[in-house]
Interface confidence: low
Amino acid sequence: LSLKGSQTLTVCPGSVQPLSSQTLRASSSAGTDPQLLLYRVVRGPQLGRLFHAQQDSTGEALVNFTQAEVYAGNILYEHEMPPEPFWEAHDTLELQLSSPPARDVAATLAVAVSFEAACPQHPSHLWKNKGLWVPEGQRARITVAALDASNLLASVPSPQRSEHDVLFQVTQFPSRGQLLVSEEPLHAGQPHFLQSQLAAGQLVYAHGGGGTQQDGFHFRAHLQGPAGASVAGPQTSEAFAITVRDVNERPPQPQASVPLRLTRGSRAPISRAQLSVVDPDSAPGEIEYEVQRAPHNGFLSLVGGGLGPVTRFTQADVDSGRLAFVANGSSVAGIFQLSMSDGASPPLPMSLAVDILPSAIEVQLRAPLEVPQALGRSSLSQQQLRVVSDREEPEAAYRLIQGPQYGHLLVGGRPTSAFSQFQIDQGEVVFAFTNFSSSHDHFRVLALARGVNASAVVNVTVRALLHVWAGGPWPQGATLRLDPTVLDAGELANRTGSVPRFRLLEGPRHGRVVRVPRARTEPGGSQLVEQFTQQDLEDGRLGLEVGRPEGRAPGPAGDSLTLELWAQGVPPAVASLDFATEPYNAARPYSVALLSVPEAARTEAGKPESSTPTGEPGPMASSPEPAVAKGGFLSFLEANMFS
């Protein structure tokens, strides 16, 4: 590994400077991909901080970065202005470059922060040169809050500093007023004042009246040694701006600002919600904003003014929708620091927060909404609706874009078409069936979180209030009695005050549900059944002929019945009775009542009937009594617990 580049970075005071390949350039003899050339920050900066443009600039200190990120200009050094003035300051970063299997290389990056540098974002070379605001025809003191060259003094070692001063020479005088030092006017014959006089509050600007045009003066500032001797050191030539304002002027009042929200890489207009002021005596075009500091997640642009960034704009630009924020690929939120002025009052600081939204959200549907049949309603939970993006979105909002067919969504017991994730989490959002003709329903919602939306369909099903037999296998070729030990909707009957009805939707695959003749005198054999009631179950009038699977060797099998259960005043529900079957075993105690057993298993006690070739059970015995298996009637009774 080898390290090229100057390993020095020059930074303007209080600014952000990207590390570049000129500053830091690693290479390896193996021609390693820059993504694999890794820098570790062994000792971070003391006068500022190192951070990644694409990551949260307020978070943890940067620990690792790659050469590729340096090439991309994503590794930034930010100088933090100290409270004490300085002319030049030096910072160092200790880095360790690694790219296995090569040996690590230690590197020191020197950072020079200097007012000497030409800085676009800090055009003055002085600690402060902010300009002055003065009412028309009046006077105002120019203090070190507005003009301060104490950073030039800071270039002198502190023991000698008290013997030095900064001499200001006015090279162009104000045209609409006068400068006075200790009440004496400055003029071409006496164009000087000192930093010490500034600090003592002795410099005054007196406006001559006759209008509110801009004024100012140009000056040269340099160090002055003991007894007024000129000394080598930093110097600068600059202008000091003086804004004259109408004495009757009412300053603009900034209004509360709503953060701008947009997705990565998109653009969005900035409206009065983000930037507005109340100023009765200024037109929107007269209220000017200037960007003091921009975030790293994008820039402001003016529509009709090309695509590039702008640093100055007016309230008129905002009001007409011409100002937009263009987001780059960063996912980090940021803040614009702005100054706002109506051209007559001192500038006021303002800020514009920009939230970068997820480019997509997902509505997670973990399970359909199950409505208990007897209740006919159920609360939605996070199981049904939850929004995630790059994180969970607890502040998601939902809007119904396709309502349910057979019910309503309720909040506070009243129909609603909009609700929040918070309301879901609190169990306040309820689905209630209002039309009891379907066992299922669905509705479509549009979820909105941090400005991004996604739609989803929530399915609703009714959970049957039905007790279903869950015992061991049933004998193939037998007919068993369907009674409340197998299917029981008695609780539903009690809750609804009605006789529940069943409709066979599907199955069984091998066998059939039949109605059993009431007595020997009742004509005909068993009848195929598609509908029955709870009363039929309780009367023992139903049988399930358990068939044998065709075309395969005898053995255990599975089968099921799918039923729709209806009752008065509640939605119907679909339920299934799943059961296992096996070849009939006379020695096995079956825990259901058998109305007949396979022909081969019958004794003389039962009237022989022929079995169907397919293995379906033969016709029922004409007696409602169960058929007697081998081993006698008593053993059959005992085995089947038949009563």
């Epitope: 207009p269 529509v303 009709g304 090309g306 100055r312 011409r322």
Partner: antibody, heavy 112, light 107 residues
Framework: QVQLQESGPGLVKPSQTLSLTCTVS?????????WNWIRQHPGKGLEWIGY???????NYNPSLKSRVTISRDTSKNQFSLKLSSVTAADTAVYYC?????WGQGTLVTVSS | DIQMTQSPSSLSASVGDRVTITCRAS??????LNWYQQKPGKAPKLLIY???SLHSGVPSRFSGSGSGTDFTLTISSLQPEDFATYYC?????????FGQGTKVEIK
Amino acid sequence: QVQLQESGPGLVKPSQTLSLTCTVSGGSITDGYYWNWIRQHPGKGLEWIGYITFDGRNNYNPSLKSRVTISRDTSKNQFSLKLSSVTAADTAVYYCADFDYWGQGTLVTVSS
Amino acid sequence: DIQMTQSPSSLSASVGDRVTITCRASQGIRNYLNWYQQKPGKAPKLLIYYTSSLHSGVPSRFSGSGSGTDFTLTISSLQPEDFATYYCQQYSKLPWTFGQGTKVEIK
């Protein structure tokens, strides 16, 4: 690159409504900012008629405001101009533009 | 409405000449000014936006300057394809308005 193409009748009778459509290709109408209509009377300068923004807001030239409607159809990536109660003074080449890019213009003559 | 006044209304120049067109706004428009070039039978083309920013694909011989109410379009060395009519347009205040145009002809 965004391209714009005006379409509509070249001849409109006085007192009727002039209707033009601008089809945007190479970009989405919801991505741009301002979709403008501008006209140029024969041998004369340019006059801004109005715009519709990417989010559907309008602004019109006050001199034409009472007669102008600009609308959009995002599904077709088009925006339209309707100018009612036309007179011979509305005879002009009508351009659709986002200022960076312009359509080639279409001449509309108002005559009976 | 803001009135935009261009001068001169027309000028004759030769290939290679330096040409300057001025545009004056009836009130301050800061830097919210575009310049367009239009050739006969064609749509205007954006040359310069925001007073001095060159639109993509526009030759560097075109430049713009000014602020407030007075603006200038300069063609440093006139080329045969530059003979056309030039318009300024303000977008500081609605309604957006254009200058009446300056026709640059061959001397």
